[in-house]
Amino acid sequence: IPVIEPSVPELVVKPGATVTLRCVGNGSVEWDGPPSPHWTLYSDGSSSILSTNNATFQNTGTYRCTEPGDPLGGSAAIHLYVKDPARPWNVLAQEVVVFEDQDALLPCLLTDPVLEAGVSLVRVRGRPLMRHTNYSFSPWHGFTIHRAKFIQSQDYQCSALMGGRKVMSISIRLKVQKVIPGPPALTLVPAELVRIRGEAAQIVCSASSVDVNFDVFLQHNNTKLAIPQQSDFHNNRYQKVLTLNLDQVDFQHAGNYSCVASNVQGKHSTSMFFRVVESAYLNLSSEQNLIQEVTVGEGLNLKVMVEAYPGLQGFNWTYLGPFSDHQPEPKLANATTKDTYRHTFTLSLPRLKPSEAGRYSFLARNPGGWRALTFELTLRYPPEVSVIWTFINGSGTLLCAASGYPQPNVTWLQCSGHTDRCDEAQVLQVWDDPYPEVLSQEPFHKVTVQSLLTVETLEHNQTYECRAHNSVGSGSWAFIPISAGAHTHPPDEFLFTP
């Protein structure tokens, strides 16, 4: 901890005296205190000297010496009184600014400690303090008004009894500011506005704050609008409201409207956009592809975005076939409003069945007319495979039929022994059929393909397998020739149950 010389807590001198305050520490030291006049500062390594050769009442104050390099942040202080019979007070501030419920220190420093018994705080022109003003006095620091209130924003003077008469300090203005959490709260309604030319419109900008000192204005495309302001006070808040009424809107009224409010804490603004249109409109769109492919048994949500003015008079989802005349269940149709003019309509299709493939249409109506948006839903299936032995043009032929979606690819395998499924070790031969014959390919249905494998003589201790695969899965059928004809083996897990 630094050491101050002279080593006294208080020093009392007369005006005109020379004062030398020396501070010594282990490392470099620094003096701090009220930046009052006439002091000279001299630093030399681990000591610092604060001196004046002509002390005045203005040098009255507490001077603190610190050692910046000290991790413990130790400091030492000395209070200097410059005892001027004509000046009992050294006032360190013209104005004190605090927030409500803070302590307000009015820095009247007594220049003579002997006068402490006769001090008091008054308002200017000798007026008494307001009732319930709770204050204390310290000769080193001045008067403290505890938990200051906004209403105590006044001009004060410090009074000292000298020779039986009261001597006043110069005045100190106390400004107690209300604790304003931030800029005024704002609302601008509506958040978005659309009108057809000739219709009426209203835009309301309102701001509120705990303090009356704030401004609010409404601007259109950066031009401030001259609108009469309505003021109110409720729920301990001041409210200012600007209402723009337009009887017949035109295109020049369109654009960006900003509601702006400001106070000492800063500025808040919020904006909305006003669109003026020639006539009613209704637009349907989807972020999804209108052509959807989903694996059978899975679920799908179809979403349509609707932008409309005026509002919708009707809407529904319709199934257009081709499989049945069923219609989507209303409980599976969901509508959410994004904002006044934009809505999202969702149709949920859980655990899709084969009969639910096809076209789904969303229809909506407003004064602008009808609009529709149609989705095409195709179901994906893993291949189903079957093999038969037949003669075509007198030649023995294995005929493999595979159906699924997307269109399956076909591969033939010949392997040794009798087996339900050829494994790698058994395979004798593999044939890929790059272009199987398409037997049927209708929209929303499975694609059925046929592949032929001509076999001159069937080897009896061998298995012929037809394998089909697509992006969903694979299927196979094993054909085992036996002496009494032929025997076919679908795999155990062959049957697919959606």
Partner: antibody, heavy 117, light 110 residues
């Protein structure tokens, strides 16, 4: 080490009030005096006023009627409000620590304020 | 119009010694200490000399300050190109009860 950073609007309309904040980092705002100084382009420096962490203020007599300073020790910030702004108030505004015998030993980088409609 | 008076400009060649003056009155320089600030182009001022002749740590000893009566001066010896800047004097003014500055001196290193 202690650093100062001014913040506030770069543009103020005539007759409006300028609000600037100085944030003190790297040290405590407490037990020091803090000043605002301004400098019009190509001109000298002008002291606006100072505030102590207790809220005590002293202002330049030529600006006193328009100036309010406040301090928020919980945020390590002090602020300046200058009302009735005119083109003559266009300047770079600096905040600085004001110390006994050393005057302005640490300065902020400054913020340019233009008064224009 | 600044309270303290400084020459608007000064110049010197590298290695030279230059002096910048600052004159005031008994209300400021006469009864109070003087501080000097250096402002490099496009930057904030920096404390160069405090309490008439004290240098903060980090300031080269080529810079020195002095005060006599109601005038003060800043001397820069061994002038360097990086010394090209504006220099301001400042002091407390008793009757204004606040800080005052000089108008600044632009130092050019030729």
């Amino acid at each position: 080490q202690v650093q100062l950073q001014e913040s506030g609007p770069g543009l103020v309309k005539p007759s409006e009030t300028l609000s600037l904040t100085c944030t003190v980092s790297g040290g405590s705002i407490s037990s020091y005096y803090w000043s605002w100084i301004r400098q019009p382009a190509g001109k000298g420096l002008e002291w606006i006023g100072r505030i102590y962490t207790s809220g005590s203020t002293n202002y330049n007599p030529s600006l006193k009627s328009r100036v309010t300073m406040s301090v928020d020790t919980s945020k390590n910030q002090f602020s300046l409000k200058l009302s009735s702004m005119t083109a003559a108030d266009t300047a770079v505004y600096y905040c600085a620590r004001d110390r006994l015998g050393r005057a302005f030993d640490i300065w902020g980088q400054g913020t340019m304020v233009t008064v224009s409609s | 119009q600044s309270v303290l008076t400084q020459p608007p400009s000064a110049s010197g060649t590298p290695g030279q010694r230059v002096t910048i003056s600052c004159s005031g009155s008994s209300s400021n320089i006469g009864s109070n200490t003087v501080n000097w600030y250096q402002q490099l182009p496009g930057t904030a001022p920096k404390l160069l000399i405090y309490s008439n002749n004290q240098r903060p740590s980090g300031v080269p000893d080529r810079f020195s300050g002095s005060k006599s009566g109601t005038s003060a001066s800043l001397a820069i010896s061994g002038l360097q190109s990086e010394d090209e800047a504006d220099y301001f004097c400042a002091a407390w003014h008793d009757s204004l009860n606040g800080r005052v500055f000089g108008g600044g001196t632009k130092l050019t290193v030729l």
